[in-house]
Interface confidence: low
């Protein structure tokens, strides 16, 4: 002629210690657990009815506490890990292309005392900008009148005509772009006269890359004479400091 222990709930707990059995008509009260709050008008009690079962509480009257709404950052997005602002959840921040995040990428909805609060301040998305790329001696770059460059903006360098008989060579990347760290993708190139010496080889001969003069990136290929072998590389390139790389090879018996 009695009910067993009352039902348990995820979000509620009994206000009194449960007993092994209860008389018909006896009532138990529930309170919201820590981190949950009462959502009227649902009941928070249950009664042992004459069928020796507990009068059901149709819906849990307690709901998880939630952190305050955080809007998308300007030029970015705030993404909830599972669609609700309740405690235990995470809010992920990402910035649009061309912007970078200042602050923490993830905020956590945490319980502080009995309140649900975010673990920190929301970050901000700051525009990625590069200062104008360096000016170079004996050359110029496109968009030289622009003062601020945005993410992925590119400039191209070119060398001026040389005053003397030898042309300026462009050393480095001719096109550089504004990267996501507000720096240019490469150092500015250099414009200078690069001229390597005539590549003399004993007991061998040049077979490709012939020229009157050997400027930057000129490539020369050698072949050994019969009965000799090459010490070093048979292919050399004129590098930016006007020397051959690797050095001109030797031929030995």
């Amino acid at each position: 002629d009695a009910c067993g222990p009352p039902p348990t709930f995820e979000a509620m707990e009994l206000t009194s210690k449960p007993k092994p059995y209860y008389k018909v008509g006896e009532q138990v009260e529930y309170d919201c657990k820590k981190g949950y709050h009462h959502f009227a008008p649902f009941l928070t009690h249950s009664i042992c009815d004459r069928n020796h079962t507990w009068l059901p509480i149709s819906d849990e009257p307690c709901v998880k506490k939630v952190c305050h709404y955080i809007p998308n950052p300007l030029h970015g997005e705030a993404i909830l890990a599972n669609g609700s602002y309740s405690f235990g959840n995470q809010l992920h921040f990402i910035c649009n292309d061309g912007y970078y995040l200042i602050g923490k990428e993830i905020l956590y909805c945490e319980l502080k005392g009995s309140d649900a609060v975010w673990s920190g301040r929301p970050p901000i998305c700051q525009k990625i900008v590069c200062k104008p790329p360096p000016k170079i001696n004996n050359g110029k770059h496109t968009f030289s009148d622009v003062e601020v460059f945005e993410y992925l903006d590119a400039v191209t360098y070119s060398c001026d005509p040389a005053p003397g008989p030898d042309p300026f060579s462009l050393i480095g990347e001719s096109t550089i772009y504004c990267r996501d760290n507000s720096l240019w993708s490469d150092d500015a190139p250099e414009c200078k006269v690069v001229k390597c010496r005539f590549p003399v080889i004993e007991n061998g001969k040049q077979i490709a890359g012939f020229g009157k003069k050997f400027y930057y990136k000129a490539t020369v290929i050698f072949e050994r004479d019969k009965g000799f072998h090459i010490i070093g590389s048979d292919t050399i390139v004129c590098n930016s400091n006007s020397t051959w790389d690797p050095p001109v090879p030797k031929c030995a018996k």
């Epitope: 602050g103 923490k104 673990s119 920190g120 301040r121 970050p123 900008v129 760290n181 507000s182």
Partner: antibody, heavy 122, light 107 residues
């Protein structure tokens, strides 16, 4: 209590190198962005380097880029500044600095060490 | 780079006075401005971040205001321990830069 103790300063010739260290205590070092800020003999403050909590993001001003390297050892609670190709204009008091309490990484230089003096002179 | 200018390099005031220290930026910095205090012994403290937010442990007699390019730090009811040099700093754009400082002395 947040404590930042710098060491490694001294007299060095132009073109020389020096490595500064900062021993951090009183907080979870690996949770915070860290910075080096220097003060010139004329009392001007200059930001020198930034490193993110995990060491992924590193920033420098142009004045030291390519010459200075900031790094950290989260296991040892240490911050470092490797300085090379030193110039007379690098002469300064170098401060190790931690960001603010509020679980952010804004450049709010909240906690400063007592500094270590670097003198670059022939 | 954004230049930060503190036009007054030194300032004399009497105890109990209200003191205002100014700082201007070479371009708008959207309130991304901090104030620091450096005592004569070299110790540096953050006073105010984001133009007007008081850092923890800083007395409420300190306040900050401003917008665009012009910012100020106000100290109400000047006390002996406020004798120091005060620096502004912008974090609107890399590289982060400081003003030249304003040295506050007692008359």
């Amino acid at each position: 209590e947040v404590q930042l103790v710098e060491s490694g300063g001294g007299l060095v010739k132009p073109g020389g190198s020096l490595k500064l260290s900062c021993a951090a205590s009183g907080f979870t070092f690996s949770d915070y962005y860290m910075y080096w800020v220097r003060q010139t003999p004329e009392k001007r403050l200059e930001w020198v380097a930034t490193i993110s909590d995990g060491g992924t993001y590193i920033y420098y001003p142009d004045s030291v880029k390519g010459r200075f390297t900031i790094s950290r050892d989260n296991a040892k609670n240490n911050l470092y500044l490797q300085m090379s190709s030193l110039k007379s204009e690098d002469t300064a008091m170098y401060y190790c600095v931690r960001d603010i309490d509020y679980d952010t990484s804004y450049p709010w230089f909240a906690y400063w060490g007592q500094g270590t003096l670097v003198t670059v002179s022939a | 780079d954004i230049q930060m200018t503190q036009t007054t390099s030194s300032l004399s005031a009497s105890l109990g006075d209200r003191v205002t220290i100014s700082c201007s930026a070479s371009q708008g910095i959207s309130n991304y401005l901090n104030w620091y205090q450096q005592k004569p012994d070299g110790t540096v403290k953050l006073l105010i971040y984001y133009t007007s937010s008081l850092h923890s442990g800083v007395p409420s007699r300190f306040s900050g205001s401003g917008s665009g390019t012009d910012y100020s730090l106000t100290i109400n009811n000047l006390e002996p321990e406020d004798i120091a040099t005060y620096y502004c700093q912008q974090y609107s754009k890399l590289p982060w830069t400081f003003g030249g400082g304003t040295k506050l002395e007692i008359k």
